[in-house]
Protein backbone atom coordinates (compact mmCIF):
# COMPACT_ATOMS: atom_id res chain seq x y z
CA UNK A 1 0.00 0.00 0.00
CA UNK A 2 1.04 3.60 -0.51
CA UNK A 3 2.50 5.03 2.70
CA UNK A 4 2.91 8.56 1.38
CA UNK A 5 -0.45 9.52 2.89
CA UNK A 6 0.43 8.29 6.40
CA UNK A 7 0.78 10.83 9.16
CA UNK A 8 4.38 10.94 10.40
CA UNK A 9 5.76 11.06 13.92
CA UNK A 10 9.44 11.20 14.89
CA UNK A 11 10.54 9.48 18.10
CA UNK A 12 13.83 9.28 19.94
CA UNK A 13 14.84 6.46 22.27
CA UNK A 14 17.99 7.20 24.26
CA UNK A 15 18.87 4.03 26.12
CA UNK A 16 21.28 3.43 28.96
CA UNK A 17 23.97 0.87 28.26
CA UNK A 18 24.03 0.08 31.99
CA UNK A 19 20.47 -1.22 32.31
CA UNK A 20 17.93 -3.43 30.62
CA UNK A 21 15.07 -1.39 29.28
CA UNK A 22 12.12 -1.74 26.96
CA UNK A 23 10.45 0.62 24.53
CA UNK A 24 6.98 0.91 23.02
CA UNK A 25 5.33 2.43 19.99
CA UNK A 26 1.60 3.15 20.01
CA UNK A 27 -0.48 2.92 16.89
CA UNK A 28 -1.58 6.51 17.33
CA UNK A 29 -3.90 6.78 14.35
CA UNK A 30 -4.93 10.29 13.27
CA UNK A 31 -8.06 11.92 14.66
CA UNK A 32 -9.80 13.54 11.70
CA UNK A 33 -10.55 10.29 9.87
CA UNK A 34 -14.24 9.47 9.68
CA UNK A 35 -13.74 5.71 9.76
CA UNK A 36 -14.51 3.53 12.76
CA UNK A 37 -10.76 2.86 13.08
CA UNK A 38 -9.55 6.39 13.30
CA UNK A 39 -12.30 7.87 15.44
CA UNK A 40 -11.16 8.91 18.90
CA UNK A 41 -13.36 9.38 21.94
CA UNK A 42 -13.65 13.03 22.80
CA UNK A 43 -13.32 13.64 26.53
CA UNK A 44 -14.02 16.68 28.61
CA UNK A 45 -10.98 17.66 30.70
CA UNK A 46 -12.76 16.43 33.85
CA UNK A 47 -13.22 12.91 32.54
CA UNK A 48 -10.59 10.31 33.30
CA UNK A 49 -9.49 8.93 29.94
CA UNK A 50 -9.64 5.15 29.72
CA UNK A 51 -8.69 4.96 26.06
CA UNK A 52 -5.63 3.72 24.31
CA UNK A 53 -3.90 6.17 22.00
CA UNK A 54 -5.60 4.23 19.19
CA UNK A 55 -9.25 3.69 20.00
CA UNK A 56 -10.87 2.78 16.74
CA UNK A 57 -11.87 -0.83 16.45
CA UNK A 58 -13.51 -2.97 19.09
CA UNK A 59 -10.76 -5.52 18.52
CA UNK A 60 -7.60 -3.55 19.18
CA UNK A 61 -5.46 -6.27 17.66
CA UNK A 62 -6.90 -5.39 14.24
CA UNK A 63 -3.77 -3.41 13.52
CA UNK A 64 -0.92 -4.41 11.24
CA UNK A 65 2.66 -3.27 11.93
CA UNK A 66 5.37 -3.08 9.30
CA UNK A 67 8.96 -1.98 9.15
CA UNK A 68 10.18 -0.03 6.15
CA UNK A 69 13.62 -1.31 5.15
CA UNK A 70 16.13 1.51 4.59
CA UNK A 71 17.17 0.03 1.22
CA UNK A 72 13.72 0.64 -0.28
CA UNK A 73 12.64 -3.03 -0.21
CA UNK A 74 8.93 -3.77 0.33
CA UNK A 75 7.47 -3.31 3.83
CA UNK A 76 8.16 -6.22 6.19
CA UNK A 77 5.57 -7.67 8.56
CA UNK A 78 6.98 -7.13 12.06
CA UNK A 79 5.66 -10.43 13.48
CA UNK A 80 7.46 -12.51 10.89
CA UNK A 81 10.87 -10.85 10.92
CA UNK A 82 11.58 -9.47 14.39
CA UNK A 83 11.52 -11.91 17.33
CA UNK A 84 12.57 -9.24 19.87
CA UNK A 85 9.53 -7.10 18.99
CA UNK A 86 6.11 -8.10 20.35
CA UNK A 87 2.76 -6.78 19.18
CA UNK A 88 0.29 -6.49 22.06
CA UNK A 89 -3.03 -5.16 20.78
CA UNK A 90 -2.06 -1.86 19.16
CA UNK A 91 1.25 -1.45 20.96
CA UNK A 92 4.63 -2.56 19.69
CA UNK A 93 7.01 -3.68 22.49
CA UNK A 94 10.77 -3.64 21.91
CA UNK A 95 12.27 -6.08 24.40
CA UNK A 96 15.91 -5.17 23.91
CA UNK A 97 17.58 -1.81 23.28
CA UNK A 98 20.03 -1.19 20.47
CA UNK A 99 20.67 1.15 17.56
CA UNK A 100 19.52 -1.64 15.22
CA UNK A 101 15.95 -0.80 16.32
CA UNK A 102 16.25 2.55 14.50
CA UNK A 103 14.01 2.77 11.46
CA UNK A 104 10.55 3.51 10.17
CA UNK A 105 7.57 1.62 11.61
CA UNK A 106 4.15 1.81 10.00
CA UNK A 107 0.83 0.78 11.49
CA UNK A 108 -2.58 0.66 9.87
CA UNK A 109 -5.90 -1.17 10.29
CA UNK A 110 -5.92 -4.77 9.04
CA UNK A 111 -9.38 -4.39 7.58
CA UNK A 112 -9.92 -1.59 5.08
CA UNK A 113 -13.64 -0.91 5.38
CA UNK A 114 -13.98 2.42 3.64
CA UNK A 115 -12.05 4.70 1.28
CA UNK A 116 -11.07 6.82 4.30
CA UNK A 117 -9.16 3.88 5.79
CA UNK A 118 -6.62 3.78 2.97
CA UNK A 119 -4.81 6.81 4.36
CA UNK A 120 -5.53 5.76 7.94
CA UNK A 121 -1.97 4.91 8.88
CA UNK A 122 0.91 6.26 10.94
CA UNK A 123 4.58 6.21 10.06
CA UNK A 124 6.85 6.38 13.08
CA UNK A 125 10.47 7.27 12.46
CA UNK A 126 12.37 5.87 15.43
CA UNK A 127 15.91 6.94 16.19
CA UNK A 128 17.73 4.90 18.83
CA UNK A 129 20.90 6.17 20.50
CA UNK A 130 22.96 5.03 23.45
CA UNK A 131 23.05 7.55 26.29
CA UNK A 132 26.27 9.52 26.16
CA UNK A 133 25.47 12.23 28.71
CA UNK A 134 27.66 11.38 31.68
CA UNK A 135 26.68 14.59 33.51
CA UNK A 136 23.50 12.91 34.71
CA UNK A 137 24.91 9.98 36.64
CA UNK A 138 21.85 9.34 38.76
CA UNK A 139 19.10 9.31 36.17
CA UNK A 140 15.95 7.48 37.23
CA UNK A 141 15.82 3.77 36.56
CA UNK A 142 13.61 2.14 33.94
CA UNK A 143 12.50 -0.21 36.73
CA UNK A 144 11.01 1.64 39.68
CA UNK A 145 9.47 0.27 42.88
CA UNK A 146 6.61 1.80 44.84
CA UNK A 147 6.15 0.80 48.46
CA UNK A 148 2.57 -0.33 49.12
CA UNK A 149 0.71 1.90 51.59
CA UNK A 150 3.21 4.75 51.44
CA UNK A 151 3.75 7.91 49.36
CA UNK A 152 5.84 7.46 46.24
CA UNK A 153 6.72 8.90 42.88
CA UNK A 154 7.44 7.74 39.34
CA UNK A 155 10.14 9.68 37.53
CA UNK A 156 10.59 10.05 33.80
CA UNK A 157 14.11 8.65 33.21
CA UNK A 158 14.95 10.99 30.35
CA UNK A 159 14.07 14.05 32.45
CA UNK A 160 14.98 12.99 35.98
CA UNK A 161 18.09 15.17 36.08
CA UNK A 162 16.11 18.31 35.40
CA UNK A 163 14.31 20.32 38.07
CA UNK A 164 10.51 20.51 37.89
CA UNK A 165 10.81 24.17 36.87
CA UNK A 166 13.08 23.41 33.87
CA UNK A 167 11.13 20.39 32.75
CA UNK A 168 9.06 20.53 29.54
CA UNK A 169 5.44 19.39 29.49
CA UNK A 170 5.31 15.61 29.69
CA UNK A 171 2.64 13.27 28.38
CA UNK A 172 2.23 10.14 30.49
CA UNK A 173 0.60 6.81 29.61
CA UNK A 174 -0.07 3.89 31.91
CA UNK A 175 -0.51 0.49 30.24
CA UNK A 176 -1.17 2.36 26.99
CA UNK A 177 -3.83 4.67 28.46
CA UNK A 178 -3.33 8.41 28.53
CA UNK A 179 -3.01 10.00 31.99
CA UNK A 180 -4.30 13.42 31.02
CA UNK A 181 -3.85 15.09 34.41
CA UNK A 182 -0.14 14.30 34.64
CA UNK A 183 2.06 16.88 32.90
CA UNK A 184 5.29 17.06 34.94
CA UNK A 185 8.43 14.92 34.84
CA UNK A 186 7.31 13.12 38.01
CA UNK A 187 4.04 11.45 38.98
CA UNK A 188 3.44 11.78 42.71
CA UNK A 189 1.37 9.00 44.29
CA UNK A 190 -0.19 9.97 47.63
CA UNK A 191 -0.87 6.39 48.67
CA UNK A 192 0.44 3.40 46.76
CA UNK A 193 -1.95 0.56 45.90
CA UNK A 194 -1.51 -2.63 43.83
CA UNK A 195 -3.14 -1.00 40.82
CA UNK A 196 -0.29 1.52 40.51
CA UNK A 197 1.83 -1.31 39.11
CA UNK A 198 2.28 -1.34 35.34
CA UNK A 199 4.12 0.00 32.29
CA UNK A 200 4.40 3.79 32.26
CA UNK A 201 5.49 5.79 29.22
CA UNK A 202 6.62 9.40 29.38
CA UNK A 203 6.85 11.57 26.27
CA UNK A 204 8.06 15.11 25.78
CA UNK A 205 8.80 17.17 22.69
CA UNK A 206 12.28 18.33 21.76
CA UNK A 207 12.83 20.76 18.90
CA UNK A 208 15.63 22.30 16.95
CA UNK A 209 15.53 24.79 14.11
CA UNK A 210 14.74 22.07 11.55
CA UNK A 211 12.27 19.70 13.19
CA UNK A 212 10.73 18.43 16.39
CA UNK A 213 10.51 14.90 17.73
CA UNK A 214 9.09 13.04 20.70
CA UNK A 215 11.56 11.78 23.30
CA UNK A 216 10.09 8.67 24.89
CA UNK A 217 11.05 6.51 27.86
CA UNK A 218 9.38 3.45 29.34
CA UNK A 219 9.27 2.71 33.06
CA UNK A 220 8.26 -0.65 34.55
CA UNK A 221 6.70 0.08 37.93
CA UNK A 222 6.29 -2.62 40.59
CA UNK A 223 4.35 -2.21 43.80
CA UNK A 224 6.21 -3.95 46.58
CA UNK A 225 5.81 -4.70 50.24
CA UNK A 226 8.28 -2.85 52.43
CA UNK A 227 11.19 -4.88 53.77
CA UNK A 228 10.29 -6.45 57.07
CA UNK A 229 11.48 -4.85 60.30
CA UNK A 230 11.07 -8.12 62.17
CA UNK A 231 13.27 -11.14 62.65
CA UNK A 232 11.68 -14.44 61.60
CA UNK A 233 9.39 -16.25 64.01
CA UNK A 234 9.29 -19.99 64.58
CA UNK A 235 5.81 -21.46 64.14
CA UNK A 236 6.79 -25.02 64.95
CA UNK A 237 7.97 -26.59 67.24
CA UNK A 238 5.92 -24.73 69.82
CA UNK A 239 6.69 -26.94 72.82
CA UNK A 240 10.18 -27.29 74.24
CA UNK A 241 9.71 -30.98 75.09
CA UNK A 242 8.66 -33.85 72.85
CA UNK A 243 7.61 -37.32 73.95
CA UNK A 244 9.32 -40.05 71.94
CA UNK A 245 9.72 -43.83 71.83
CA UNK A 246 13.24 -45.21 72.10
CA UNK A 247 14.39 -47.18 69.05
CA UNK A 248 11.79 -45.59 66.76
CA UNK A 249 12.51 -43.17 63.88
CA UNK A 250 11.70 -39.52 64.51
CA UNK A 251 11.24 -36.43 62.37
CA UNK A 252 11.15 -33.01 64.00
CA UNK A 253 9.96 -30.19 61.81
CA UNK A 254 10.99 -26.58 62.15
CA UNK A 255 8.67 -24.13 60.40
CA UNK A 256 9.53 -20.44 60.35
CA UNK A 257 7.85 -17.37 58.92
CA UNK A 258 10.08 -14.83 57.15
CA UNK A 259 8.80 -11.36 56.27
CA UNK A 260 9.33 -9.87 52.81
CA UNK A 261 12.84 -8.73 51.91
CA UNK A 262 13.93 -7.58 48.48
CA UNK A 263 17.28 -9.26 49.01
CA UNK A 264 16.19 -12.50 50.63
CA UNK A 265 18.75 -14.84 52.20
CA UNK A 266 16.90 -16.82 54.85
CA UNK A 267 18.76 -19.17 57.17
CA UNK A 268 17.05 -22.15 58.79
CA UNK A 269 19.15 -24.89 60.35
CA UNK A 270 19.23 -27.48 63.09
CA UNK A 271 22.01 -27.98 65.55
CA UNK A 272 22.50 -30.23 68.55
CA UNK A 273 23.65 -29.22 72.03
CA UNK A 274 25.21 -31.93 74.16
CA UNK A 275 26.65 -30.64 77.45
CA UNK A 276 29.32 -28.12 76.36
CA UNK A 277 29.38 -29.18 72.73
CA UNK A 278 27.18 -28.00 69.92
CA UNK A 279 27.26 -28.87 66.22
CA UNK A 280 25.19 -28.28 63.11
CA UNK A 281 23.31 -31.29 61.77
CA UNK A 282 23.33 -32.26 58.13
CA UNK A 283 19.62 -32.42 57.39
CA UNK A 284 17.44 -32.38 54.24
CA UNK A 285 17.27 -29.05 52.43
CA UNK A 286 14.92 -26.35 53.65
CA UNK A 287 11.86 -25.80 51.49
CA UNK A 288 9.19 -23.15 51.19
CA UNK A 289 5.77 -24.56 52.04
CA UNK A 290 3.82 -21.32 51.67
CA UNK A 291 4.62 -18.16 49.74
CA UNK A 292 2.55 -14.97 49.89
CA UNK A 293 3.17 -11.35 49.01
CA UNK A 294 4.06 -10.58 52.65
CA UNK A 295 5.79 -13.70 53.88
CA UNK A 296 7.47 -16.97 53.10
CA UNK A 297 7.03 -20.01 55.36
CA UNK A 298 10.05 -22.27 55.21
CA UNK A 299 10.34 -25.73 56.70
CA UNK A 300 13.37 -27.83 57.53
CA UNK A 301 13.26 -31.27 59.14
CA UNK A 302 15.71 -33.14 61.28
CA UNK A 303 15.46 -36.92 60.87
CA UNK A 304 16.67 -39.42 63.45
CA UNK A 305 16.83 -43.00 62.16
CA UNK A 306 16.12 -44.23 65.69
CA UNK A 307 15.93 -42.41 68.98
CA UNK A 308 18.69 -43.46 71.39
CA UNK A 309 19.23 -42.95 75.11
CA UNK A 310 21.93 -40.42 74.22
CA UNK A 311 19.38 -38.31 72.26
CA UNK A 312 17.40 -37.86 75.49
CA UNK A 313 20.33 -35.95 77.00
CA UNK A 314 20.64 -33.63 74.02
CA UNK A 315 18.86 -30.48 73.01
CA UNK A 316 17.78 -30.12 69.37
CA UNK A 317 17.85 -26.46 68.40
CA UNK A 318 16.22 -24.86 65.36
CA UNK A 319 17.97 -21.62 64.39
CA UNK A 320 16.39 -19.16 61.95
CA UNK A 321 17.77 -15.86 60.71
CA UNK A 322 17.14 -13.00 58.30
CA UNK A 323 18.91 -9.66 57.84
CA UNK A 324 17.22 -8.26 60.96
CA UNK A 325 18.12 -10.96 63.45
CA UNK A 326 17.72 -14.55 64.57
CA UNK A 327 15.41 -16.72 66.65
CA UNK A 328 15.92 -20.17 68.15
CA UNK A 329 13.66 -22.86 69.54
CA UNK A 330 15.07 -25.84 71.40
CA UNK A 331 13.44 -29.22 71.89
CA UNK A 332 14.31 -31.73 74.60
CA UNK A 333 13.29 -35.34 73.92
CA UNK A 334 11.48 -37.18 76.70
CA UNK A 335 10.79 -40.92 76.80
CA UNK A 336 7.15 -41.89 76.53
CA UNK A 337 6.02 -43.78 79.66
CA UNK A 338 3.67 -46.74 79.64
Amino acid sequence: FNISGCSTKKLLWTYSTRSEEEFVLFCDLPEPQKSHFCHRNRLSPKQVPEHLPFMGSNDLSDVQWYQQPSNGDPLEDIRKSYPHIIQDKCTLHFLTPGVNNSGSYICRPKMIKSPYDVACCVKMILEVKPQTNASCEYSASHKQDLLLGSTGSISCPSLSCQSDAQSPAVTWYKNGKLLSVERSNRIVVDEVYDYHQGTYVCDYTQSDTVSSWTVRAVVQVRTIVGDTKLKPDILDPVEDTLEVELGKPLTISCKARFGFERVFNPVIKWYIKDSDLEWEVSVPEAKSIKSTLKDEIIERNIILEKVTQRDLRRKFVCFVQNSIGNTTQSVQLKEKRG
Partner: nanobody, 116 residues
Protein backbone atom coordinates in the same frame (compact mmCIF):
# COMPACT_ATOMS: atom_id res chain seq x y z
CA UNK B 1 23.09 -13.54 44.95
CA UNK B 2 20.36 -15.87 43.68
CA UNK B 3 20.76 -16.86 40.05
CA UNK B 4 19.16 -19.18 37.51
CA UNK B 5 21.04 -20.27 34.40
CA UNK B 6 19.30 -22.22 31.62
CA UNK B 7 21.01 -24.50 29.11
CA UNK B 8 20.16 -27.24 26.62
CA UNK B 9 18.39 -25.20 23.95
CA UNK B 10 19.16 -25.61 20.26
CA UNK B 11 17.84 -26.55 16.85
CA UNK B 12 15.79 -29.75 16.64
CA UNK B 13 13.62 -31.33 13.94
CA UNK B 14 9.84 -31.70 14.40
CA UNK B 15 9.14 -34.86 16.40
CA UNK B 16 12.54 -34.65 18.12
CA UNK B 17 13.43 -34.23 21.78
CA UNK B 18 15.43 -31.82 23.94
CA UNK B 19 16.19 -31.62 27.63
CA UNK B 20 16.53 -28.18 29.18
CA UNK B 21 18.38 -27.66 32.45
CA UNK B 22 18.25 -24.78 34.89
CA UNK B 23 21.04 -24.49 37.46
CA UNK B 24 20.05 -22.60 40.60
CA UNK B 25 22.66 -20.96 42.80
CA UNK B 26 22.53 -18.71 45.84
CA UNK B 27 19.28 -20.19 47.19
CA UNK B 28 19.31 -21.23 50.84
CA UNK B 29 16.03 -23.15 50.44
CA UNK B 30 13.91 -24.80 47.76
CA UNK B 31 11.30 -22.29 46.51
CA UNK B 32 7.59 -23.18 46.80
CA UNK B 33 7.40 -23.46 43.00
CA UNK B 34 9.86 -23.62 40.17
CA UNK B 35 8.59 -23.07 36.65
CA UNK B 36 9.40 -23.11 32.96
CA UNK B 37 8.02 -20.30 30.80
CA UNK B 38 8.44 -19.57 27.11
CA UNK B 39 8.18 -16.61 24.80
CA UNK B 40 7.65 -17.20 21.10
CA UNK B 41 8.46 -14.48 18.54
CA UNK B 42 5.73 -11.85 18.60
CA UNK B 43 3.89 -13.44 21.55
CA UNK B 44 3.54 -12.89 25.27
CA UNK B 45 5.45 -15.02 27.77
CA UNK B 46 3.46 -18.08 28.88
CA UNK B 47 3.85 -20.64 31.63
CA UNK B 48 4.76 -24.10 30.28
CA UNK B 49 5.10 -26.17 33.45
CA UNK B 50 5.65 -25.78 37.17
CA UNK B 51 6.61 -28.03 40.05
CA UNK B 52 5.91 -27.65 43.78
CA UNK B 53 8.19 -28.66 46.64
CA UNK B 54 5.98 -31.74 47.13
CA UNK B 55 6.86 -32.71 43.51
CA UNK B 56 3.31 -32.14 42.20
CA UNK B 57 3.33 -30.70 38.68
CA UNK B 58 1.11 -28.67 36.37
CA UNK B 59 1.37 -28.20 32.60
CA UNK B 60 -0.03 -25.91 29.91
CA UNK B 61 -2.62 -27.73 27.78
CA UNK B 62 -0.45 -27.33 24.69
CA UNK B 63 2.42 -29.38 26.19
CA UNK B 64 0.55 -31.88 28.39
CA UNK B 65 1.75 -35.42 27.69
CA UNK B 66 4.79 -34.22 25.71
CA UNK B 67 6.80 -32.24 28.27
CA UNK B 68 7.93 -33.36 31.74
CA UNK B 69 9.22 -31.06 34.49
CA UNK B 70 11.43 -32.46 37.25
CA UNK B 71 14.00 -31.30 39.74
CA UNK B 72 17.09 -32.70 41.39
CA UNK B 73 17.40 -30.91 44.72
CA UNK B 74 20.80 -32.44 45.41
CA UNK B 75 22.14 -30.80 42.25
CA UNK B 76 19.99 -27.64 42.60
CA UNK B 77 18.80 -28.21 39.05
CA UNK B 78 15.41 -27.98 37.35
CA UNK B 79 14.75 -29.90 34.12
CA UNK B 80 12.29 -29.81 31.26
CA UNK B 81 12.18 -32.91 29.09
CA UNK B 82 10.54 -31.99 25.79
CA UNK B 83 9.40 -34.79 23.46
CA UNK B 84 7.45 -34.80 20.18
CA UNK B 85 8.50 -31.22 19.54
CA UNK B 86 6.48 -29.12 17.09
CA UNK B 87 7.34 -25.94 15.16
CA UNK B 88 4.97 -24.01 17.45
CA UNK B 89 7.20 -24.93 20.42
CA UNK B 90 9.88 -22.60 18.99
CA UNK B 91 10.56 -19.97 21.66
CA UNK B 92 12.99 -18.68 24.23
CA UNK B 93 12.51 -20.87 27.34
CA UNK B 94 12.96 -19.31 30.77
CA UNK B 95 13.35 -20.90 34.17
CA UNK B 96 11.81 -19.05 37.14
CA UNK B 97 11.61 -19.36 40.93
CA UNK B 98 8.63 -18.37 43.06
CA UNK B 99 9.31 -16.04 45.97
CA UNK B 100 6.91 -13.98 48.05
CA UNK B 101 3.80 -14.79 46.08
CA UNK B 102 5.18 -14.41 42.54
CA UNK B 103 7.73 -15.73 40.07
CA UNK B 104 10.36 -13.12 40.94
CA UNK B 105 13.68 -14.75 40.03
CA UNK B 106 14.29 -15.37 36.31
CA UNK B 107 17.01 -16.87 34.17
CA UNK B 108 18.27 -15.24 30.97
CA UNK B 109 16.59 -17.83 28.71
CA UNK B 110 17.65 -20.48 26.21
CA UNK B 111 16.44 -20.58 22.59
CA UNK B 112 14.66 -23.66 21.27
CA UNK B 113 14.08 -23.80 17.50
CA UNK B 114 11.95 -26.58 16.01
CA UNK B 115 12.40 -26.67 12.25
CA UNK B 116 13.06 -29.11 9.45
Amino acid sequence: EVQLVESGGGLVQPGGSLRLSCAASGFTYIPAYMGWFRQAPGKERERVASIKTDASTTYADSVEGRFTISQDNAKNTLYLQMNSLRPEDTAVYYCAAYQFGAFRVWGQGTLVTVSS
